[in-house]
Protein backbone atom coordinates (compact mmCIF):
# COMPACT_ATOMS: atom_id res chain seq x y z
CA UNK A 1 0.00 0.00 0.00
CA UNK A 2 0.92 3.69 -0.14
CA UNK A 3 2.07 5.13 3.17
CA UNK A 4 2.16 8.72 4.28
CA UNK A 5 4.23 8.85 7.45
CA UNK A 6 3.89 11.19 10.42
CA UNK A 7 6.88 13.06 9.01
CA UNK A 8 5.16 13.55 5.62
CA UNK A 9 7.27 11.05 3.73
CA UNK A 10 5.36 9.21 1.01
CA UNK A 11 6.27 5.64 0.18
CA UNK A 12 4.83 2.69 -1.69
CA UNK A 13 5.45 -0.46 0.30
CA UNK A 14 5.19 -4.10 -0.65
CA UNK A 15 5.07 -5.19 3.01
CA UNK A 16 3.11 -8.44 2.99
CA UNK A 17 1.47 -10.09 5.99
CA UNK A 18 1.05 -8.40 9.39
CA UNK A 19 2.99 -5.22 10.16
CA UNK A 20 2.78 -2.67 12.98
CA UNK A 21 1.57 0.71 11.75
CA UNK A 22 1.54 2.40 15.17
CA UNK A 23 2.90 1.05 18.43
CA UNK A 24 3.08 3.37 21.41
CA UNK A 25 2.07 3.49 25.07
CA UNK A 26 -1.58 4.14 24.27
CA UNK A 27 -2.32 2.49 21.00
CA UNK A 28 -1.32 -0.38 18.79
CA UNK A 29 -2.34 -0.58 15.14
CA UNK A 30 -1.49 -3.59 13.03
CA UNK A 31 -2.26 -4.07 9.34
CA UNK A 32 -2.30 -7.20 7.22
CA UNK A 33 -1.48 -6.68 3.57
CA UNK A 34 -2.11 -9.14 0.76
CA UNK A 35 -0.97 -9.16 -2.89
CA UNK A 36 -3.50 -7.45 -5.15
CA UNK A 37 -2.84 -9.91 -7.98
CA UNK A 38 -1.22 -13.35 -8.07
CA UNK A 39 2.53 -12.93 -8.41
CA UNK A 40 2.38 -9.20 -7.78
CA UNK A 41 4.70 -7.43 -5.34
CA UNK A 42 2.09 -4.70 -4.88
CA UNK A 43 -0.06 -5.31 -1.80
CA UNK A 44 -3.16 -3.72 -0.27
CA UNK A 45 -4.61 -3.78 3.23
CA UNK A 46 -7.03 -6.62 3.88
CA UNK A 47 -7.18 -6.51 7.69
CA UNK A 48 -6.71 -3.89 10.38
CA UNK A 49 -6.51 -4.35 14.13
CA UNK A 50 -6.47 -1.41 16.53
CA UNK A 51 -5.88 -1.92 20.24
CA UNK A 52 -6.68 1.00 22.52
CA UNK A 53 -4.80 0.25 25.72
CA UNK A 54 -6.35 0.52 29.16
CA UNK A 55 -5.85 4.15 30.32
CA UNK A 56 -6.40 5.48 33.83
CA UNK A 57 -10.04 6.26 34.65
CA UNK A 58 -10.83 6.85 30.99
CA UNK A 59 -11.00 3.64 29.00
CA UNK A 60 -10.77 -0.11 29.32
CA UNK A 61 -8.70 -1.94 26.71
CA UNK A 62 -10.72 -2.00 23.50
CA UNK A 63 -10.01 -3.85 20.28
CA UNK A 64 -11.30 -2.79 16.87
CA UNK A 65 -10.93 -5.22 14.01
CA UNK A 66 -11.85 -4.65 10.36
CA UNK A 67 -11.47 -7.04 7.45
CA UNK A 68 -12.38 -7.05 3.78
CA UNK A 69 -16.18 -6.84 3.54
CA UNK A 70 -16.48 -6.37 7.28
CA UNK A 71 -16.16 -2.85 8.62
CA UNK A 72 -17.88 -2.96 12.02
CA UNK A 73 -19.27 0.10 13.74
CA UNK A 74 -18.38 -1.29 17.17
CA UNK A 75 -15.41 -2.71 19.07
CA UNK A 76 -14.86 -6.47 19.15
CA UNK A 77 -16.95 -6.74 22.34
CA UNK A 78 -19.90 -4.97 20.68
CA UNK A 79 -19.50 -1.71 22.57
CA UNK A 80 -19.21 1.71 20.94
CA UNK A 81 -17.28 3.50 23.68
CA UNK A 82 -14.48 2.99 26.17
CA UNK A 83 -16.32 0.71 28.56
CA UNK A 84 -17.51 1.22 32.13
CA UNK A 85 -14.99 3.74 33.39
CA UNK A 86 -15.94 7.26 34.34
CA UNK A 87 -14.48 8.81 31.18
CA UNK A 88 -15.59 6.04 28.82
CA UNK A 89 -17.10 8.48 26.34
CA UNK A 90 -13.64 9.84 25.61
CA UNK A 91 -13.38 6.88 23.20
CA UNK A 92 -16.17 6.63 20.65
CA UNK A 93 -16.90 4.92 17.35
CA UNK A 94 -19.13 6.65 14.81
CA UNK A 95 -20.39 4.93 11.69
CA UNK A 96 -20.29 7.52 8.92
CA UNK A 97 -21.42 5.28 6.06
CA UNK A 98 -22.61 1.78 6.84
CA UNK A 99 -19.99 -0.83 5.95
CA UNK A 100 -17.76 1.75 4.30
CA UNK A 101 -16.61 4.50 6.63
CA UNK A 102 -15.98 4.52 10.36
CA UNK A 103 -14.47 7.22 12.55
CA UNK A 104 -12.95 6.55 15.97
CA UNK A 105 -12.42 9.48 18.33
CA UNK A 106 -10.01 8.88 21.20
CA UNK A 107 -10.26 12.24 22.99
CA UNK A 108 -8.14 11.08 25.93
CA UNK A 109 -5.15 10.95 23.58
CA UNK A 110 -6.32 13.69 21.19
CA UNK A 111 -6.53 11.16 18.39
CA UNK A 112 -8.91 10.66 15.46
CA UNK A 113 -8.80 7.54 13.30
CA UNK A 114 -10.66 7.05 10.02
CA UNK A 115 -11.09 3.57 8.57
CA UNK A 116 -12.72 2.98 5.21
CA UNK A 117 -13.45 0.09 2.93
CA UNK A 118 -12.95 1.19 -0.65
CA UNK A 119 -13.56 -1.57 -3.16
CA UNK A 120 -12.19 -4.76 -1.64
CA UNK A 121 -9.51 -3.17 0.52
CA UNK A 122 -9.19 -1.02 3.61
CA UNK A 123 -7.71 2.44 4.08
CA UNK A 124 -6.48 3.98 7.33
CA UNK A 125 -5.85 7.57 8.39
CA UNK A 126 -4.98 9.04 11.77
CA UNK A 127 -4.46 12.42 13.40
CA UNK A 128 -2.37 12.22 16.54
CA UNK A 129 -0.46 14.67 18.75
CA UNK A 130 3.35 14.43 18.49
CA UNK A 131 3.52 13.80 22.22
CA UNK A 132 1.42 10.64 21.75
CA UNK A 133 3.30 9.58 18.61
CA UNK A 134 6.57 9.66 20.54
CA UNK A 135 5.25 8.08 23.75
CA UNK A 136 7.25 4.87 23.45
CA UNK A 137 8.95 3.18 26.42
CA UNK A 138 11.61 1.36 24.48
CA UNK A 139 12.94 3.51 21.66
CA UNK A 140 14.83 0.56 20.17
CA UNK A 141 11.59 -1.31 19.61
CA UNK A 142 10.43 1.35 17.17
CA UNK A 143 12.28 -0.20 14.25
CA UNK A 144 9.30 -1.21 12.15
CA UNK A 145 6.63 1.19 13.32
CA UNK A 146 5.55 2.14 9.80
CA UNK A 147 3.75 5.43 10.47
CA UNK A 148 6.80 6.81 12.26
CA UNK A 149 9.76 5.27 10.48
CA UNK A 150 8.37 4.34 7.07
CA UNK A 151 8.86 0.92 5.56
CA UNK A 152 12.25 -0.74 5.26
CA UNK A 153 14.16 0.13 2.11
CA UNK A 154 13.97 -3.44 0.83
CA UNK A 155 10.16 -3.28 1.16
CA UNK A 156 9.73 -0.12 -0.89
CA UNK A 157 8.58 0.02 -4.50
CA UNK A 158 10.12 2.76 -6.58
CA UNK A 159 7.00 3.87 -8.36
CA UNK A 160 8.73 6.79 -10.01
CA UNK A 161 10.80 4.29 -11.99
CA UNK A 162 7.65 2.29 -12.67
CA UNK A 163 5.93 5.42 -13.92
CA UNK A 164 8.81 6.23 -16.26
CA UNK A 165 8.41 2.72 -17.74
CA UNK A 166 4.65 3.12 -18.04
CA UNK A 167 4.98 6.48 -19.79
CA UNK A 168 7.40 5.16 -22.38
CA UNK A 169 5.74 4.24 -25.70
CA UNK A 170 6.37 0.49 -25.36
CA UNK A 171 5.61 -0.65 -21.85
CA UNK A 172 7.98 -3.40 -20.65
CA UNK A 173 6.30 -6.79 -20.26
CA UNK A 174 7.18 -7.05 -16.59
CA UNK A 175 7.37 -3.84 -14.63
CA UNK A 176 8.78 -4.73 -11.25
CA UNK A 177 5.75 -4.26 -8.97
CA UNK A 178 3.43 -6.41 -11.05
CA UNK A 179 4.46 -9.05 -13.54
CA UNK A 180 0.86 -9.14 -14.79
CA UNK A 181 0.09 -5.53 -15.72
CA UNK A 182 -3.56 -5.51 -16.81
CA UNK A 183 -3.64 -4.44 -20.44
CA UNK A 184 -7.17 -3.19 -19.81
CA UNK A 185 -5.74 0.11 -18.56
CA UNK A 186 -3.56 2.06 -20.98
CA UNK A 187 -1.50 4.76 -19.31
CA UNK A 188 -3.63 7.53 -20.84
CA UNK A 189 -6.85 6.04 -19.44
CA UNK A 190 -5.34 5.69 -15.98
CA UNK A 191 -4.18 9.30 -16.10
CA UNK A 192 -7.61 10.50 -17.21
CA UNK A 193 -9.45 8.53 -14.50
CA UNK A 194 -7.13 9.81 -11.78
CA UNK A 195 -7.22 13.38 -13.05
CA UNK A 196 -11.02 13.28 -12.75
CA UNK A 197 -10.87 12.75 -8.98
CA UNK A 198 -7.45 14.20 -8.21
CA UNK A 199 -6.87 17.33 -10.30
CA UNK A 200 -3.61 18.23 -8.51
CA UNK A 201 -0.76 16.11 -9.84
CA UNK A 202 0.67 15.31 -6.43
CA UNK A 203 1.78 11.99 -4.98
CA UNK A 204 -1.82 10.92 -4.29
CA UNK A 205 -2.46 11.37 -8.00
CA UNK A 206 0.74 9.46 -8.87
CA UNK A 207 -0.30 6.68 -6.47
CA UNK A 208 -3.68 6.52 -8.19
CA UNK A 209 -2.08 6.13 -11.61
CA UNK A 210 0.29 3.46 -10.26
CA UNK A 211 -2.62 1.53 -8.73
CA UNK A 212 -4.70 1.58 -11.90
CA UNK A 213 -1.76 0.42 -13.98
CA UNK A 214 -0.88 -2.39 -11.60
CA UNK A 215 -4.42 -3.66 -10.98
CA UNK A 216 -6.88 -2.25 -13.50
CA UNK A 217 -9.26 -1.75 -10.55
CA UNK A 218 -10.93 1.69 -10.64
CA UNK A 219 -11.75 1.47 -6.92
CA UNK A 220 -8.15 2.45 -6.26
CA UNK A 221 -8.98 5.87 -7.73
CA UNK A 222 -11.45 6.34 -4.89
CA UNK A 223 -8.95 5.01 -2.36
CA UNK A 224 -6.48 7.75 -3.32
CA UNK A 225 -9.24 10.35 -3.42
CA UNK A 226 -10.50 9.46 0.07
CA UNK A 227 -6.95 9.30 1.42
CA UNK A 228 -6.50 12.89 0.28
CA UNK A 229 -9.91 13.88 1.67
CA UNK A 230 -9.07 12.29 5.02
CA UNK A 231 -5.74 14.11 4.91
CA UNK A 232 -7.64 17.39 4.45
CA UNK A 233 -9.64 16.65 7.56
CA UNK A 234 -6.80 15.27 9.68
CA UNK A 235 -3.63 17.10 8.66
CA UNK A 236 -2.94 20.12 10.82
CA UNK A 237 -0.88 21.94 8.19
CA UNK A 238 -3.05 22.47 5.11
CA UNK A 239 -0.02 23.76 3.18
CA UNK A 240 1.60 20.34 3.49
CA UNK A 241 -1.46 18.41 2.36
CA UNK A 242 -0.29 17.88 -1.21
CA UNK A 243 3.05 16.09 -1.39
CA UNK A 244 5.10 16.24 -4.55
CA UNK A 245 7.88 14.10 -5.97
CA UNK A 246 11.32 14.54 -4.55
CA UNK A 247 14.44 12.45 -4.59
CA UNK A 248 13.63 9.43 -2.51
CA UNK A 249 14.90 9.60 1.04
CA UNK A 250 16.16 6.64 2.95
CA UNK A 251 13.97 5.89 5.95
CA UNK A 252 15.78 6.68 9.19
CA UNK A 253 17.66 3.75 10.67
CA UNK A 254 15.68 0.97 9.06
CA UNK A 255 17.28 -2.19 7.86
CA UNK B 1 -33.20 2.32 8.38
CA UNK B 2 -32.40 2.46 12.09
CA UNK B 3 -32.35 -1.27 12.85
CA UNK B 4 -28.71 -1.10 13.99
CA UNK B 5 -29.75 1.40 16.65
CA UNK B 6 -32.27 -1.14 17.97
CA UNK B 7 -29.56 -3.81 17.97
CA UNK B 8 -27.09 -1.70 19.93
CA UNK B 9 -29.75 -0.53 22.42
CA UNK B 10 -30.69 -4.14 23.10
CA UNK B 11 -27.04 -5.05 23.48
CA UNK B 12 -26.42 -2.32 26.03
CA UNK B 13 -29.64 -3.12 27.92
CA UNK B 14 -28.56 -6.74 28.34
CA UNK B 15 -25.03 -6.13 29.52
CA UNK B 16 -24.23 -9.84 29.47
CA UNK B 17 -24.34 -9.45 25.70
CA UNK B 18 -25.36 -12.58 23.85
CA UNK B 19 -24.96 -14.85 26.88
CA UNK B 20 -28.07 -16.40 28.37
CA UNK B 21 -29.37 -14.47 31.36
CA UNK B 22 -29.24 -15.98 34.83
CA UNK B 23 -32.68 -17.29 35.86
CA UNK B 24 -33.36 -14.34 38.19
CA UNK B 25 -32.58 -11.95 35.32
CA UNK B 26 -35.12 -13.52 32.95
CA UNK B 27 -37.96 -11.00 33.60
CA UNK B 28 -35.53 -8.15 32.96
CA UNK B 29 -34.19 -9.90 29.86
CA UNK B 30 -37.73 -10.44 28.55
CA UNK B 31 -38.53 -6.77 29.16
CA UNK B 32 -35.43 -5.82 27.17
CA UNK B 33 -36.50 -8.21 24.41
CA UNK B 34 -39.95 -6.64 24.24
CA UNK B 35 -38.33 -3.20 24.00
CA UNK B 36 -36.14 -4.55 21.20
CA UNK B 37 -39.20 -5.95 19.43
CA UNK B 38 -41.01 -2.61 19.72
CA UNK B 39 -37.96 -0.79 18.39
CA UNK B 40 -37.79 -3.09 15.35
CA UNK B 41 -41.52 -2.65 14.73
CA UNK B 42 -40.98 1.09 14.76
CA UNK B 43 -38.37 0.75 12.02
CA UNK B 44 -40.38 -1.80 10.05
CA UNK B 45 -41.55 0.48 7.27
CA UNK B 46 -38.09 1.78 6.44
CA UNK B 47 -36.25 -1.50 7.03
CA UNK B 48 -38.78 -4.11 5.94
CA UNK B 49 -36.91 -5.18 2.82
CA UNK B 50 -33.46 -5.35 4.43
CA UNK B 51 -31.73 -8.46 5.72
CA UNK B 52 -30.71 -6.80 9.02
CA UNK B 53 -34.36 -6.19 9.86
CA UNK B 54 -35.48 -9.75 9.15
CA UNK B 55 -32.49 -11.17 11.06
CA UNK B 56 -33.44 -9.04 14.06
CA UNK B 57 -37.10 -10.09 13.91
CA UNK B 58 -36.22 -13.79 13.69
CA UNK B 59 -33.60 -13.41 16.40
CA UNK B 60 -36.16 -11.82 18.72
CA UNK B 61 -38.67 -14.59 18.05
CA UNK B 62 -36.03 -17.24 18.83
CA UNK B 63 -34.94 -15.54 22.06
CA UNK B 64 -38.56 -15.00 23.14
CA UNK B 65 -39.31 -18.70 22.80
CA UNK B 66 -35.99 -19.81 24.33
CA UNK B 67 -36.64 -17.77 27.47
CA UNK B 68 -40.42 -18.28 27.55
CA UNK B 69 -41.03 -14.54 27.31
CA UNK B 70 -44.61 -13.48 26.80
CA UNK B 71 -45.30 -11.03 23.97
CA UNK B 72 -47.18 -8.75 26.38
CA UNK B 73 -45.65 -7.32 29.50
CA UNK B 74 -43.37 -4.57 30.70
CA UNK B 75 -40.65 -3.11 28.51
CA UNK B 76 -37.35 -1.74 29.78
CA UNK B 77 -35.48 1.52 29.43
CA UNK B 78 -31.98 1.08 27.97
CA UNK B 79 -29.78 0.52 30.98
CA UNK B 80 -27.46 3.31 32.06
CA UNK B 81 -24.54 1.52 33.66
CA UNK B 82 -23.68 2.69 37.16
CA UNK B 83 -20.86 5.18 37.44
CA UNK B 84 -18.25 5.70 40.10
CA UNK B 85 -19.11 7.96 43.05
CA UNK B 86 -22.33 9.88 43.19
CA UNK B 87 -22.85 13.53 42.49
CA UNK B 88 -22.65 12.97 38.75
CA UNK B 89 -25.50 13.26 36.31
CA UNK B 90 -27.04 10.05 34.99
CA UNK B 91 -25.58 10.58 31.55
CA UNK B 92 -21.95 9.68 31.49
CA UNK B 93 -19.74 12.59 30.49
CA UNK B 94 -16.07 12.81 29.59
CA UNK B 95 -15.74 14.33 33.03
CA UNK B 96 -12.22 13.62 34.29
CA UNK B 97 -10.05 16.28 32.68
CA UNK B 98 -7.38 13.64 32.14
CA UNK B 99 -9.79 12.03 29.65
CA UNK B 100 -9.78 15.07 27.41
CA UNK B 101 -6.31 15.44 25.96
CA UNK B 102 -6.64 19.00 24.72
CA UNK B 103 -8.06 20.28 28.00
CA UNK B 104 -5.38 18.61 30.09
CA UNK B 105 -2.64 19.54 27.60
CA UNK B 106 -3.53 23.25 27.70
CA UNK B 107 -2.98 23.17 31.44
CA UNK B 108 0.77 22.86 31.05
CA UNK B 109 1.61 23.78 27.49
CA UNK B 110 0.64 25.50 24.27
CA UNK B 111 -1.73 23.79 21.82
CA UNK B 112 -0.43 20.35 20.81
CA UNK B 113 1.29 19.74 17.48
CA UNK B 114 -0.69 17.23 15.46
CA UNK B 115 0.69 14.78 12.93
CA UNK B 116 -1.01 12.66 10.30
CA UNK B 117 -0.38 9.18 8.94
CA UNK B 118 -2.30 7.43 6.18
CA UNK B 119 -2.28 4.05 4.45
CA UNK B 120 -4.22 3.32 1.26
CA UNK B 121 -4.30 1.65 -2.14
CA UNK B 122 -1.63 -0.75 -3.38
Amino acid sequence: PHLRTFTDHFQTCKVQGAWPLIDNNYLNVQVTNTPVLPGSAATATSKLTIIFKNFQECVDQKVYQAEMDELPSAFADGSKNGGDKHGANSLKITEKVSGQHVEIQAKYIGTTIVVRQVGRYLTFAVRMPEEVVNAVEDRDSQGLYLCLRGCPLNQQIDFQAFRANAESPRRPAAASPSPVVPETFPYETAVAKCKEKLPVEDLYYQACVFDLLTTGDVNFTLAAYYALEDGKMLHSNKDKLHLFERTRELPGAVA
Amino acid sequence: CKILKCNSEFWSATSSGSHAPASDDVPEFCAALRTYALCTRRTARTCRGDLAYHSAVHGIEDLMSQHNCSKDGPTSQPRVRTLPPAGDSQERSDSPEICHYEKSFHKHSAAPNYTHCGLFGD
Partner: antibody, heavy 115, light 112 residues
Framework: EVQLVESGGGLVQPGGSLRLSCAAS????????MNWVRQAPGKGLEWIGM????????HYADSVKGRFTISRDNSKNTLYLQMNSLRAEDTAVYYC????????WGQGTMVTVSS | DVVLTQSPLSLPVTLGQPASISCRSS???????????LEWFQQRPGQSPRLLIY???SRFSGVPDRFSGSGSGTDFTLKISRVEAEDVGVYYC?????????FGQGTKLEIK
Protein backbone atom coordinates in the same frame (compact mmCIF):
# COMPACT_ATOMS: atom_id res chain seq x y z
CA GLU C 1 -18.80 4.36 -2.37
CA VAL C 2 -22.33 3.26 -3.23
CA GLN C 3 -22.82 3.19 -7.00
CA LEU C 4 -25.98 2.37 -8.93
CA VAL C 5 -25.92 2.37 -12.71
CA GLU C 6 -29.15 1.99 -14.67
CA SER C 7 -29.21 0.78 -18.27
CA GLY C 8 -31.63 -0.57 -20.86
CA GLY C 9 -33.61 2.60 -21.55
CA GLY C 10 -34.53 3.73 -25.04
CA LEU C 11 -37.36 4.32 -27.47
CA VAL C 12 -40.20 1.81 -27.54
CA GLN C 13 -43.63 1.76 -29.18
CA PRO C 14 -46.85 1.82 -27.16
CA GLY C 15 -47.76 -1.73 -26.15
CA GLY C 16 -44.11 -2.76 -26.32
CA SER C 17 -41.78 -4.10 -23.63
CA LEU C 18 -38.44 -3.08 -22.15
CA ARG C 19 -36.22 -4.46 -19.44
CA LEU C 20 -34.15 -2.08 -17.34
CA SER C 21 -31.14 -3.16 -15.30
CA CYS C 22 -29.46 -1.55 -12.33
CA ALA C 23 -25.90 -2.64 -11.54
CA ALA C 24 -25.00 -2.09 -7.89
CA SER C 25 -21.59 -1.79 -6.25
CA UNK C 26 -19.97 -0.36 -3.12
CA UNK C 27 -22.34 -2.09 -0.69
CA UNK C 28 -23.60 -5.61 0.06
CA UNK C 29 -26.41 -5.68 -2.47
CA UNK C 30 -27.95 -8.91 -1.16
CA UNK C 31 -28.60 -7.28 2.24
CA UNK C 32 -30.90 -4.49 1.06
CA UNK C 33 -34.36 -3.91 -0.29
CA MET C 34 -34.32 -1.93 -3.55
CA ASN C 35 -36.67 0.57 -5.19
CA TRP C 36 -37.55 1.86 -8.64
CA VAL C 37 -38.69 5.48 -8.99
CA ARG C 38 -39.46 7.42 -12.17
CA GLN C 39 -39.69 11.04 -13.25
CA ALA C 40 -41.62 12.15 -16.33
CA PRO C 41 -39.98 15.04 -18.23
CA GLY C 42 -40.44 18.28 -16.29
CA LYS C 43 -42.53 16.51 -13.63
CA GLY C 44 -42.08 15.24 -10.09
CA LEU C 45 -40.95 11.88 -8.72
CA GLU C 46 -43.21 8.82 -8.77
CA TRP C 47 -42.51 5.68 -6.76
CA ILE C 48 -42.90 2.54 -8.87
CA GLY C 49 -42.17 -0.28 -6.47
CA MET C 50 -39.75 -2.12 -4.21
CA UNK C 51 -38.36 -5.61 -3.72
CA UNK C 52 -37.07 -7.25 -0.53
CA UNK C 53 -33.43 -8.31 -0.16
CA UNK C 54 -34.32 -11.96 -0.89
CA UNK C 55 -37.12 -11.28 -3.43
CA UNK C 56 -39.64 -12.67 -0.92
CA UNK C 57 -41.95 -9.66 -1.29
CA UNK C 58 -42.57 -7.02 -3.92
CA HIS C 59 -44.76 -3.93 -3.68
CA TYR C 60 -45.97 -1.82 -6.61
CA ALA C 61 -47.68 1.49 -7.30
CA ASP C 62 -51.24 1.11 -8.65
CA SER C 63 -50.24 2.78 -11.93
CA VAL C 64 -47.87 -0.07 -12.88
CA LYS C 65 -49.43 -3.07 -11.11
CA GLY C 66 -49.85 -6.01 -13.49
CA ARG C 67 -47.63 -4.42 -16.15
CA PHE C 68 -44.26 -3.98 -14.43
CA THR C 69 -42.27 -6.67 -12.59
CA ILE C 70 -39.31 -6.03 -10.30
CA SER C 71 -36.73 -8.79 -9.87
CA ARG C 72 -33.13 -9.13 -8.75
CA ASP C 73 -30.12 -11.38 -9.13
CA ASN C 74 -28.03 -11.15 -5.97
CA SER C 75 -25.22 -13.20 -7.50
CA LYS C 76 -24.84 -10.49 -10.14
CA ASN C 77 -25.56 -7.52 -7.85
CA THR C 78 -28.24 -6.48 -10.31
CA LEU C 79 -31.82 -5.21 -9.99
CA TYR C 80 -34.27 -5.44 -12.90
CA LEU C 81 -37.50 -3.77 -14.00
CA GLN C 82 -39.46 -5.64 -16.67
CA MET C 83 -41.94 -3.24 -18.28
CA ASN C 84 -44.75 -4.62 -20.45
CA SER C 85 -47.77 -3.03 -22.18
CA LEU C 86 -45.99 0.32 -22.18
CA ARG C 87 -48.00 3.52 -22.57
CA ALA C 88 -47.06 7.07 -23.56
CA GLU C 89 -47.45 8.13 -19.91
CA ASP C 90 -44.65 5.71 -18.93
CA THR C 91 -42.18 8.03 -20.68
CA ALA C 92 -39.75 9.07 -17.93
CA VAL C 93 -36.28 8.81 -16.46
CA TYR C 94 -36.19 5.62 -14.39
CA TYR C 95 -34.05 5.53 -11.25
CA CYS C 96 -33.09 2.61 -9.05
CA UNK C 97 -32.44 3.39 -5.40
CA UNK C 98 -30.90 1.46 -2.52
CA UNK C 99 -32.71 0.57 0.68
CA UNK C 100 -36.24 -0.25 1.76
CA UNK C 101 -36.87 3.44 1.44
CA UNK C 102 -34.55 5.10 -1.06
CA UNK C 103 -31.29 6.55 0.23
CA UNK C 104 -28.72 6.33 -2.59
CA TRP C 105 -29.93 6.76 -6.18
CA GLY C 106 -28.49 5.99 -9.60
CA GLN C 107 -28.20 8.54 -12.41
CA GLY C 108 -31.27 7.20 -14.21
CA THR C 109 -32.03 5.86 -17.69
CA MET C 110 -34.49 7.48 -20.10
CA VAL C 111 -37.44 5.51 -21.46
CA THR C 112 -39.47 7.04 -24.28
CA VAL C 113 -42.77 5.42 -25.28
CA SER C 114 -43.87 6.82 -28.61
CA SER C 115 -45.08 5.70 -32.00
CA ASP D 1 -53.68 6.35 -1.19
CA VAL D 2 -51.77 8.99 0.76
CA VAL D 3 -51.48 12.36 -0.97
CA LEU D 4 -48.65 14.69 0.08
CA THR D 5 -49.20 18.37 -0.65
CA GLN D 6 -46.19 20.69 -0.59
CA SER D 7 -46.21 24.45 -0.25
CA PRO D 8 -45.07 26.72 -1.62
CA LEU D 9 -44.49 25.19 -5.07
CA SER D 10 -41.94 27.90 -5.81
CA LEU D 11 -39.68 29.50 -3.22
CA PRO D 12 -37.43 32.43 -4.16
CA VAL D 13 -34.89 33.05 -1.37
CA THR D 14 -32.03 35.49 -0.81
CA LEU D 15 -28.62 33.91 -0.22
CA GLY D 16 -27.89 33.57 3.49
CA GLN D 17 -31.56 33.81 4.45
CA PRO D 18 -33.62 30.97 5.91
CA ALA D 19 -36.13 28.91 3.91
CA SER D 20 -39.03 26.72 4.97
CA ILE D 21 -41.03 24.14 3.00
CA SER D 22 -44.25 22.57 4.26
CA CYS D 23 -45.52 19.06 3.49
CA ARG D 24 -49.09 18.08 4.42
CA SER D 25 -50.36 14.53 4.32
CA SER D 26 -53.92 13.46 3.58
CA UNK D 27 -53.70 11.06 6.55
CA UNK D 28 -51.50 10.62 9.58
CA UNK D 29 -48.04 9.23 8.85
CA UNK D 30 -47.65 7.80 12.35
CA UNK D 31 -48.04 4.04 12.28
CA UNK D 32 -49.57 1.88 15.02
CA UNK D 33 -46.18 1.35 16.69
CA UNK D 34 -45.38 5.03 16.89
CA UNK D 35 -43.01 5.30 13.92
CA UNK D 36 -43.37 8.18 11.46
CA UNK D 37 -41.72 7.63 8.10
CA LEU D 38 -41.32 10.88 6.25
CA GLU D 39 -38.23 11.72 4.20
CA TRP D 40 -37.00 14.80 2.34
CA PHE D 41 -35.06 14.68 -0.93
CA GLN D 42 -33.17 17.36 -2.82
CA GLN D 43 -32.85 17.27 -6.60
CA ARG D 44 -30.38 19.74 -8.02
CA PRO D 45 -30.80 20.73 -11.69
CA GLY D 46 -29.74 17.85 -13.96
CA GLN D 47 -28.96 15.53 -11.04
CA SER D 48 -30.48 12.53 -9.30
CA PRO D 49 -32.42 13.00 -6.07
CA ARG D 50 -30.38 12.96 -2.86
CA LEU D 51 -31.68 11.98 0.57
CA LEU D 52 -31.49 14.82 3.10
CA ILE D 53 -33.73 13.83 6.03
CA TYR D 54 -35.29 10.51 7.05
CA UNK D 55 -37.72 9.57 9.85
CA UNK D 56 -38.96 13.19 9.95
CA UNK D 57 -35.87 14.74 11.55
CA SER D 58 -32.77 12.52 11.17
CA ARG D 59 -30.12 14.05 8.90
CA PHE D 60 -28.62 11.60 6.41
CA SER D 61 -24.87 11.05 6.27
CA GLY D 62 -22.98 14.00 4.76
CA VAL D 63 -25.93 16.42 4.84
CA PRO D 64 -24.98 19.89 6.18
CA ASP D 65 -26.50 20.82 9.52
CA ARG D 66 -28.24 23.84 8.02
CA PHE D 67 -30.91 21.35 6.90
CA SER D 68 -33.42 20.24 9.53
CA GLY D 69 -36.73 18.41 9.52
CA SER D 70 -39.61 18.55 11.98
CA GLY D 71 -43.29 17.73 12.34
CA SER D 72 -45.68 14.94 13.30
CA GLY D 73 -48.96 13.38 12.25
CA THR D 74 -49.91 15.14 9.03
CA ASP D 75 -47.80 18.35 9.10
CA PHE D 76 -44.08 18.37 8.33
CA THR D 77 -41.49 21.03 7.61
CA LEU D 78 -38.05 21.18 6.02
CA LYS D 79 -35.98 24.17 7.10
CA ILE D 80 -32.75 25.53 5.66
CA SER D 81 -31.20 27.90 8.19
CA ARG D 82 -29.06 29.85 5.69
CA VAL D 83 -29.56 29.21 2.00
CA GLU D 84 -26.43 28.71 -0.10
CA ALA D 85 -26.10 28.78 -3.89
CA GLU D 86 -25.70 24.98 -4.01
CA ASP D 87 -29.16 24.53 -2.39
CA VAL D 88 -30.94 25.51 -5.61
CA GLY D 89 -33.17 22.74 -6.90
CA VAL D 90 -36.43 20.93 -6.23
CA TYR D 91 -37.26 19.52 -2.78
CA TYR D 92 -39.61 16.55 -2.38
CA CYS D 93 -41.20 15.07 0.72
CA UNK D 94 -41.80 11.30 0.65
CA UNK D 95 -43.84 9.04 2.90
CA UNK D 96 -43.09 5.38 3.61
CA UNK D 97 -45.73 4.72 6.27
CA UNK D 98 -48.50 3.55 3.94
CA UNK D 99 -48.43 1.49 0.74
CA UNK D 100 -48.17 2.66 -1.96
CA UNK D 101 -45.29 4.95 -1.00
CA UNK D 102 -45.66 8.48 -2.38
CA PHE D 103 -43.88 11.76 -3.06
CA GLY D 104 -45.06 15.34 -2.74
CA GLN D 105 -45.25 17.32 -5.98
CA GLY D 106 -42.03 19.20 -5.24
CA THR D 107 -41.00 22.72 -4.23
CA LYS D 108 -38.61 24.63 -6.47
CA LEU D 109 -36.09 26.68 -4.50
CA GLU D 110 -34.40 29.47 -6.43
CA ILE D 111 -32.16 32.39 -5.54
CA LYS D 112 -33.73 35.86 -5.65
Amino acid sequence: EVQLVESGGGLVQPGGSLRLSCAASGFTFSNYGMNWVRQAPGKGLEWIGMIYYDSSEKHYADSVKGRFTISRDNSKNTLYLQMNSLRAEDTAVYYCAKGSTPDYWGQGTMVTVSS
Amino acid sequence: DVVLTQSPLSLPVTLGQPASISCRSSQSLEDSDGGTFLEWFQQRPGQSPRLLIYDVSSRFSGVPDRFSGSGSGTDFTLKISRVEAEDVGVYYCFQATHDPLSFGQGTKLEIK
